[in-house]
């Protein structure tokens, strides 16, 4: 399987809400001993590999923001902790998963990564991630609403997989 990022760049005005999205592509094993761990974090475009470094999103670590379930089941994060920080991550039955950030500030600008781990118990973990940029703008040049820029087909299909 792979992870696609429908949009590679989100440009939003300060104070707006945004939902960053990733999508699981390809066959998903729904076997008894296969589970999925999904999470979000901030990162940097590192020299070695994009998304390798895991930084908190609004002081919440990737451990705090994770989703866990089997196959394409719906799930969402621990509400209390995340919502206190204006965050919510969620997953649906169709392989889409997202993080919503409320009341954006300039400090929210940066690179965001979604990580999917397919856990094949007794065998191995299979990691895939996607990356997208969030730019929060203020002043007269800022858009009135979030503007999203689609990933090129090459980018969205060329997500690193372990």
């Amino acid at each position: 399987f792979k992870v696609a990022t429908p949009y590679s760049l989100y440009v939003c005005p300060e104070g707006q809400n945004v939902t960053l999205t990733c999508r699981l592509l390809g066959p998903v094993d729904k076997g008894h001993d296969v589970t999925f761990y999904k999470t979000w974090y901030r990162s940097s475009r590192g020299e070695v590999q994009t998304c390798s470094e895991r930084r908190p999103i609004r002081n919440l670590t990737f451990q705090d923001l994770h989703l866990h379930h089997g196959g394409h089941q719906a799930a969402n994060t621990s509400h209390d902790l995340a919502q206190r920080h204006g965050l919510e991550s969620a997953s649906d039955h169709h392989g889409n998963f997202s993080i919503t950030m409320r009341n954006l500030t300039l400090l929210d600008s940066g690179l965001y990564c979604c990580l999917v781990v397919e856990i094949r118990h007794h065998h191995s973990e299979h990691r895939v991630h996607g990356a997208m940029e969030l730019q929060v703008q203020t002043g007269k040049d800022a858009p009135s609403n979030c503007v999203v820029y689609p990933s090129s087909s090459q980018d969205s299909e060329n997500i690193t997989a372990a």
Epitope: T35, H68, V117, I119, H121, H123, S124, E125, A162
Partner: antibody, heavy 117, light 107 residues
């Protein structure tokens, strides 16, 4: 702040079953891998196995025939049973939280188990 | 299973010196390697994950590098509290395995 605490007898007789419990406090046990790791005196670390929050288990092949790990989410505890112990099973036993695609990020303080008659 | 070999077994250095610890895997582990520090009577503490990323709260003097089969943990300038045993651990496949450890002792 998640904390782990091992408990169980410090002395077990050869051929008997070693039983330890790890209590998770300050966080949910309903996610992650919950692992047991041991360290014989003066030696290195050996991964024994884990139980995933869903109940799936995975054991080190070198110990698989003797190991059972179980979880009681209502008590926020997971347990290790190691049967037919010998002196070679004398070690400090640690429980640890293992995060998928990450590492063992939180450890208990360890409990020494001696196998002796 | 993947065997991790650490060298040297013991490293005798003075505070302020640079420590270079090696971990070699019997087959490629990509960059899925962690480093832990263990002091006498204590549980191990995570230092580095994914070969080169410092865990939360770990000082910048600790750095990791490498990928595939050869990895290095570097302590740029040893502090008194850094004298301990260091273990590498792979997580590309189960069973998860640790190296035999490198003891960094005061010269």
């Amino acid at each position: 702040q998640v904390q782990l605490q091992e408990s169980g007898p410090g002395l077990v007789k050869p051929s008997e079953t070693l039983s330890l419990t790890c209590t998770v406090s300050g966080g949910s046990i309903s996610s992650y891998y919950w692992s047991w790791i041991r360290q014989p005196p003066g030696k290195g670390l050996e991964w024994i196995g884990y139980i995933y929050y869903s109940g799936s288990t995975n054991y080190n092949p070198s110990l698989k025939s003797r190991v059972t790990i179980s979880v009681d989410t209502s008590k926020s505890q997971f347990s290790l049973k190691l049967s037919s112990v010998t002196a070679a099973d004398t070690a400090v036993y640690y429980c640890a939280r293992d995060i998928p695609a990450f590492a063992f990020d939180i450890w208990g303080q360890g409990t020494m188990v001696i196998v002796s008659s | 299973e993947i065997v991790l070999t650490q060298s040297p077994a013991t490293l005798s250095l003075s505070p302020g010196e640079r420590a270079t610890l090696s971990c070699r895997a019997s087959q490629s582990v990509n960059y899925y390697l962690a480093w832990y520090q263990q002091k006498p009577g204590q549980a191990p503490r995570l230092l580095i994950y994914d070969a080169f990323n410092r865990a939360t709260g770990i000082p910048a003097r600790f750095s990791g590098s490498g990928s595939g089969t050869d990895f290095t943990l570097t302590i740029s300038s040893l502090e008194p509290e850094d004298f301990a045993v260091y273990y590498c651990q792979q997580r590309i496949s189960w069973p998860l395995t640790f190296g035999g450890g490198t003891k960094v002792e005061i010269k």
